[in-house]
Interface confidence: low
């Protein structure tokens, strides 16, 4: 079924900034998506089209993006009457009227929002759940439920506290099945809430951008402190392992790492890419981490190459790849890191991002399936993760409707899928492999 | 290539049970879900029901409840489905059948195994 | 249950005849429809799938078409490999069931 009409529209992020969203028309209805934007931003990744209009939303805006949808996108796509099943050649046709090679022209936001949208119709049209079209657009066989990886402490960019790392996660990869990890997930949240309450007081406990605590630590081993504390007291310290995102671009001076950038700049107390893989070889020995994300800057390739050969754990490129085929190729020939952390924003398609992925996959990468931390209701990524059996998500903490969206809707996955689930469990890195 | 090869013909009592082995090779015998599809003598097919190797969930045809179990063994990669108080009607040749890209849709079968119930 | 009734039953044609036969459920199935080609003596094959994706390896002179109740399987030019029964088949939930088939013979 082709598509009839095509209307995009300014709305809110989780943040309160403006964002993309898009309805799109076939005769079995209406499609809605809404997409995603970083609090930091890769700078290799496509170009999220903003008014930079100052009088209007700080700058943010995105009417301009709205206006290529309903001005130029729309009218292209109704007219060419290609069916919605038909995901890569609308991408494709998107992709090429942009002309751009990082979507500038009419923006990743905006390619991206009638990419999903076209993607949700073309699961109605067939008769199948969205996880289940887009396994078939991935050329999947089957389906598998992730493991959750909770992003429970705040740091880096994203939080007001001392502490440099960005995130620090729990995977309830124990479990056995989602709604297991779920509630796992969940009691270990809560647990965390009171021991950061019974240490630094009521106020720790306020959330952040994506649900988490940002209690006022500055020792990012006091983090993981907090954690092992809280997944003991509730009960799971064999079920549950702990993945980190350090974001480490953001604290990245001239070839050294400040892990104190939130203070007064001190180029005395830098440390080298070898000290600061020390220091996470020692959190691997000390504690249960398993996942350690963007460890190093997005261009210290030599730093990457060296740590993920000797660490023995997951080593997610998020910064460094940033969904980019190019430098997901390049990252692979320098095996700098072993997964793939998917965000479809980043590349702005999703054809692009299921490319991604398979190639990722194809080179015997993990891949995890990631939110933003400006998010709206979409539960796409929960689907997308689904069908595309990478067997690991990280969409905030259990807390937080626009993270929540996501859990509630993989929860509902599996129960359609009954005793059809599969749950990637301790298989997380390579569900597929039995 | 993807087999499934299944044990020999049967002929059973009245209110005996049997047991049919179905042999995976070719695939990841955990990744997909296998059913099994009954079909009596110039008759058309019945679907019995199903089980996921990955986690032994199963689901039966209601018609079969209580008599059937299926079962897997993954180390030899092998399904099972065993059926329980024999009538003459179960007289029929038995299928396992893999489940392919959509649920539901069987892109494997076995070559089938008469049983045949007679006193 | 959701019942499949297929029509004919039984169907007599020629090598290169257009052959069509249909399918129809009880209840809206969307597009949670299989076809299967069953010879004498062996396991059924599968032949469309989602109602009208073709599996590799199938010959294109088949194609399949519908949606919700009503079905079609068709077979532009017939050949002699081609003379077998015929049977859709819903996966709209469990329990999954079959038509009674539709047996093509030559004429």
């Known amino acids: 079924m082709s598509i009839l009409k095509i209307h995009a529209r300014e709305i809110f992020d989780s943040r309160g900034n403006p964002t993309v969203e898009v309805d799109l028309f076939t005769s079995k209805g209406l499609f809605r998506a809404a997409v995603p934007s970083g609090a930091s931003t890769g700078i290799y990744e496509a170009l999220e089209l903003r008014d930079n209009d100052k009088t209007r939303y700080m700058g943010k805006g995105v009417s301009k993006a709205v206006e290529h949808i309903n001005k130029t996108i729309a009218p292209a796509l109704v007219s060419k009457k290609l069916n919605v099943t038909e995901q890569e050649k609308i991408d494709k046709l998107m992709i090429e009227m942009d002309g751009t090679e990082n979507k500038s022209k009419f923006g990743a936001n905006a390619i991206l929002g009638v990419s999903l949208a076209v993607c949700k119709a073309g699961a109605v049209e067939k008769g199948v759940p969205l996880y289940r079209h887009i396994a078939d657009l991935a050329g999947n066989s089957e389906v598998i439920l992730p493991v959750p990886a909770f992003n429970v402490i705040n740091g880096g960019s994203h939080a007001g506290n001392k502490l440099a790392m960005q995130e620090f996660m729990i995977l309830p990869v124990g479990a056995a099945n989602f709604r297991e990890a779920m509630r796992i997930g969940a009691e270990v949240y809560h647990n965390l809430k009171n021991v950061i309450k019974e240490k630094y007081g009521k106020d720790a406990t306020n959330v952040g951008d994506e649900g988490g605590f940002a209690p006022n630590i500055l020792e990012n081993k006091e983090g993981l402190e907090l954690l092992k504390t809280a997944i003991g007291k509730a009960g799971y310290t064999d079920k549950v392992v702990i993945g980190m995102d350090v974001a480490a671009s953001e604290f990245f001076r001239s070839g050294k790492y400040d892990l104190d950038f939130k203070s007064p700049d001190d180029p005395s107390r830098y440390i080298s890419p070898d000290q600061l893989a020390d220091l996470y070889k020692s959190f691997i020995k000390d504690y249960p981490v398993v996942s350690i994300e963007d460890p190093f800057d997005a261009d210290d390739w030599g730093a990457w190459q060296k740590f993920t050969a000797s660490a023995g754990i997951q080593v997610v490129g998020d910064d460094l790849t940033v969904t980019n085929p190019k430098r997901i190729a390049k990252a692979v020939n320098e095996k700098s890191c072993n997964c793939l952390l998917l965000k479809v924003n980043q590349i702005g398609s999703v054809t692009e991002s299921l490319q991604a992925c398979k190639l990722a996959q194809a080179n015997g990468w993990g891949v995890m399936v990631s939110h933003r931390s400006g998010e709206t209701e979409d539960t796409f990524i929960a689907d997308l993760v689904v069908g595309l059996c990478t067997g690991q998500i990280k969409t905030g903490a259990p807390c937080r409707s626009e993270r929540l969206a996501k859990y509630n809707q993989l929860l509902r996955i599996e129960e359609e899928l009954g005793s059809k689930a599969k749950f990637a469990g301790r298989n997380f890195r390579n569900p597929l492999a039995k | 290539q993807v087999q499934l090869v299944q044990s020999g013909a049967e002929v059973k009592k009245p209110g005996a049970s049997v047991k049919v082995s179905c042999k995976a090779s070719?695939?990841?015998?955990?990744?997909?879900?296998m059913n099994w599809v009954r079909q009596a003598p110039g008759q058309g097919l019945e679907w019995m029901g199903y089980?996921?190797?990955?986690?032994?969930?199963?689901k039966y045809n209601e018609k079969f409840k209580g008599r059937v179990t299926m079962t897997t063994d993954t180390s030899t990669s092998t399904a099972y489905m065993e059926l329980r108080s024999l009538r003459s009607d179960d007289t029929a040749v038995y299928y396992c059948?893999?489940?392919?890209?959509?649920?539901?849709?069987?892109?494997?079968w076995g070559q089938g195994t008469l049983v045949t119930v007679s006193s | 249950d959701i019942q499949m009734t297929q029509s004919p039953s039984s169907l007599s044609a020629s090598v290169g005849d257009r052959v069509t036969i249909t399918c129809r459920a009880s209840?809206?199935?969307?597009?949670?429809l299989t076809w299967y080609q069953q010879k004498p003596g062996k396991a059924p094959k599968l032949l469309i799938y989602?109602?009208?994706t073709l599996p590799e390896g199938v010959p294109s002179r088949f194609s399949g078409s519908g949606s919700g109740t009503d079905f079609t399987l068709t077979i532009s030019s017939l050949q002699p490999e081609d003379f077998a029964t015929y049977y859709c088949?819903?996966?709209?939930?469990?329990?999954?069931?079959f038509g009674q088939g539709t047996k093509l013979e030559i004429k």
């Open positions: 059948a893999r489940e392919g890209f959509y649920y539901g849709n069987f892109d494997n």
């Open positions: 070719g695939y990841t015998f955990t990744s997909s879900v």
């Open positions: 089980i996921n190797p990955y986690n032994d969930g199963t």
């Open positions: 209840e809206n199935i969307y597009s949670y």
């Open positions: 989602n109602a009208k």
């Open positions: 088949q819903h996966h709209y939930g469990t329990p999954y069931t």
